[in-house]
């Protein structure tokens, strides 16, 4: 981009240096070079000389016209051909930007991940603006009317210690850039309604060789929330559709969930929880794979294991993967 250059003249853009993408724009260059009546004025975009749509306005000024300008950023500079000068003389340069005004932020969501000490607010920013867009998150107590504002370029983490106006708040988001400003609808929250329990994790699986073989999935969470509802979904890795089991859970001990599965098939499991009756779910846990044996018992440990199988009676393989899938719509 154009940084520090000594100008011998002036370059400007109409309608503005930052403009709406797809507009027709004019770039003007006016020379003010001592002892130089420019024979010709040249325009460069990103270092490449422009050859068309240049109009000489008067002895010192020229105009470059662009129709339907679609580049998000460009560095422009202009030069003059001066008599008795072998090289072109730099007049001035300017960085120009095109983009869009922000959309109205929607789907404003605030959650408190248990133990985080923060309220995390996110929103759908809408279409890409291409230009610097800032967001101001407003948090206003419904009782004290104390309003706090947080400037960010994406989501925001707000310390719950700073929320001193009780438990009931309005939250809304203002989006602003050089081309416009929009404001979201107001979200009314109660701090206790937006807590998401500490992540539930599947630790191991075992298949017990009974008359009808049964697979036990062991899973746990460090949550202190008493009433927690969870869902475990599972499917054969070759399948598209998930089966879902629901549980009312008390995490004072490790959970054991029983499944009657087909033999010699690789399954994938995920779990997620929410405080019973509340709005927001955890994202689905990491993928946990378990292959049911043909006949012999099988134990699998840790989430997202390697595909390591041997001929022994018990197989355990460990990997530290954090792959999650299909998290869309889990919060909201």
């Amino acid at each position: 981009g154009i940084t520090n250059i000594n100008c011998s003249g002036h370059i400007w853009v109409e309608p503005a240096t930052i403009f709406k993408m797809g507009m027709n724009i004019s770039i003007y260059c006016q020379a003010a070079i001592k002892n130089c009546q420019p024979r010709k004025l040249h325009f460069y975009k990103n270092g490449i000389k422009e050859r068309f749509q240049i109009t000489r306005i008067n002895k010192t000024t020229a105009r470059l016209w662009y129709k339907n300008f679609l580049e998000p950023h460009a560095s422009m500079y202009c030069t003059a051909e001066c008599p008795k000068h072998f090289q072109e003389t730099l007049i001035c340069g300017k960085d120009i930007s095109s983009g869009y005004p922000p959309d109205i932020p929607d789907e404003v969501t605030c959650v408190i991940y248990e133990y985080s000490g923060n309220m995390t607010c996110t929103w759908n920013a809408g279409k890409l603006t291409y230009i610097d867009t800032k967001y101001v998150v407003h948090v206003k107590s419904l009782e004290t009317e104390e309003e706090q504002q947080y400037l960010t370029s994406s989501y925001i983490n707000i310390s719950t210690d700073s929320l001193q106006g009780g438990k009931k708040y309005l939250v809304w988001v203002q989006a602003a850039n050089a081309l416009g400003m929009e404001e979201s609808k107001q979200l009314q929250i109660h701090l206790d309604d937006i807590v998401i329990p500490s992540a539930a994790v599947i630790s191991r699986a075992e298949t017990i060789n009974a008359t009808v073989p049964k697979t036990i999935i062991y899973w746990d969470s460090q949550t202190t929330i008493e009433k927690v509802s969870c869902e475990m979904r599972y499917k054969a890795t070759t399948n598209q559709t998930w089966n879902v089991k629901e549980f009312d859970t008390n995490f004072t001990y490790v959970q054991q969930s029983e499944f009657y599965l087909e033999p010699n098939i690789k399954y994938v499991f995920q779990v997620r929880c929410q405080e019973t009756g509340k709005r927001y779910w955890q994202p689905w846990s990491s993928l946990f794979f378990h292959k049911t044996p043909e006949t012999v018992p099988q134990v699998t440990s840790k989430a997202f294991q390697h595909d390591t199988w041997n001929s022994g009676l018990t197989v355990a393989s460990i990997s530290t993967g954090h792959l999650t899938s299909d998290n869309r719509g889990d919060i909201g």
Partner: antibody, heavy 119, light 107 residues
């Protein structure tokens, strides 16, 4: 010392109107949400109106909505309850109370003022 | 509206007794419950906020507990000056509601 001094109670005929006042002192009135709570002759407590610190957010239960209006004058440190279309069931002792938002509770109460609705 | 069902309505006690009053909310109110004491001819006085927090100056014989829908208020050792009516109140919704009250009387 926090004080809530109430005035304005009395005897009113059914369908009549009355305005209660609550003068606050000893704290920054404009920083606190306020409420009106009444106590029926049977000694039940009923919350009848609430207002946020700046007066932007106002709440009423259904049984008084459209008949009662809570307001405040932060310059005068005073809370008001304008009551109209009064009914016999509005007969009660009315209290103003300060809401301590970070406690989710009413921590200071006025001395109460009596409204009797009777023909 | 959220209903707060308080029980019992009356309690006959002797000095030194342990007293427990319960309040059940018609839906979860988190821990947004307060307990008040009202003596004859006086305004209500805040004792407990956020279900279990003792208000400034309240003796430690008064305790509260609970979360969600079930709440308990306890006086560990009743004294003569504790004879009063006790009310629970939820502040979870924007429309607060009170329990019907429990009257403590001496045997």
């Amino acid at each position: 010392e926090v004080q809530l001094q109430q005035s304005g109670g009395g005897l009113v005929k059914p369908g009549g109107s009355l305005k209660l006042s609550c003068a606050a002192s000893g704290f920054t009135f404009s920083s606190y949400a306020m409420s009106w709570v009444r106590q029926t002759p049977e000694k039940r407590l009923e919350w009848v109106a609430g207002i946020s610190s700046g007066g932007s957010y106002i709440y009423y239960p259904d049984n008084v909505k459209g008949r009662f209006t809570i307001s405040r004058d932060n310059a005068r440190n005073t809370l008001y309850l304008q009551m109209s279309s009064l009914r016999s069931e509005d007969t009660a002792m009315y209290y103003c109370a300060r809401k301590k938002s970070d406690y989710g509770a009413m921590d200071y109460w006025g001395q109460g003022t009596t409204l009797t609705v009777s023909s | 509206d959220i209903q707060m069902t308080q029980s019992p309505k009356f309690l006959l006690v002797s000095a030194g007794d342990r007293v427990t009053i319960t309040c059940k909310a018609s839906q979860s109110v988190s821990n947004d419950v307060a307990w008040y004491q009202q003596k004859p001819g006086q305004s209500p006085r805040l004792l407990i906020y956020y279900a279990s927090n003792r208000y400034t100056g309240v003796p430690d014989r008064f305790t509260g507990s609970g979360y969600g829908t079930d709440f308990t208020f306890t006086i560990s050792t009743v004294q003569a000056e504790d004879l009063a009516v006790y009310f629970c109140q939820q502040d979870y919704s924007s429309l607060p509601t009170f329990g019907a009250g429990t009257k403590l009387e001496m045997k």
